[in-house]
């Protein structure tokens, strides 16, 4: 396993609809054709997998149908979007990139993006 640099923004604020987007960029050391991207969430020293996708270079990034993540890839950067976030989902979201094929295998883990989620205030009842 060889190490690889990964960069991502330090902080992102989710939209009022609970959507957060950020870029994950990696320093590809060679001609990888198969890449796996995983988003991990770290909160209270617990790390859980949020979503993961494997893609072939030049093809779309495909997450599972029930995933809360979507994304697109362009060269050695991935644009990730996480949906359905609530205030309780606030935490550090870490981008993990693996170059799966061809060998050698490379692994890179970013420093994480702190995503802040603020639940919207409920609208006051209207008389109309």
């Amino acid at each position: 396993c060889k190490a690889m640099h990964v960069a991502q923004p330090a902080v992102v604020l989710a939209s009022s609809r609970g959507i957060a987007s950020f870029v994950c960029e990696y320093a590809s050391p060679g001609k990888a054709t198969e890449v796996r991207v995983t988003v991990l969430r770290q909160a209270d020293s617990q790390v859980t997998e949020v979503c993961a996708a494997t893609y072939m270079m030049g093809n779309e990034l495909t997450f599972l149908d029930d995933s809360i993540c979507t994304g697109t890839s362009s060269g050695n950067q991935v644009n990730l979007t996480i949906q359905g976030l609530r205030a309780m989902d606030t935490g550090l979201y870490i981008c993990k990139v693996e170059l799966m094929y061809p060998p050698p295998y490379y692994l890179g883990i970013g420093n994480g993006t702190q995503i802040y989620v603020i639940d919207p205030e409920p609208c006051p009842d209207s008389d109309f």
Epitope: H5, V6, A7, Q8, V23, E25, Y26, A27, S28, P29, G30, K31, A32, T33, M57, G58, G75, N76, Q77
Partner: nanobody
Amino acid sequence: EVQLVESGGGLVQPGGSLRLSCASSGDTLESFAVGWFRQAPGKEREELACIGRTGEFTDYPGSVKGRFTITRDNSKNTVYLQMVSLRAEDTAVYYCAAERLVFHLCSLSEYDYDTWGQGTQVTVSS
């Protein structure tokens, strides 16, 4: 849009040195990571070096590490490849390529670059 033009190639004796330049005639290069590659006749394109937008991050494959150095001068819109201790096997057409990135990293994979120059010939021979 960025348009890349390489220069600085030519004929050099074994053991000699050359400095190649990659300049943009279009957009400013400071939003782009830049890589240098080469291709010899009948061979695959080979990665040589890359440099991130700010110049703080560089990467090299083991094959040229220590002999080739990549630098950039964003005020001149130019990226350089300094090559020393040249050998006959360094004879090839040398290309630079650019990729717009958000952060400071760069890639050694030719697959990641979408803008390429026309190349400059380097011949190492006595």
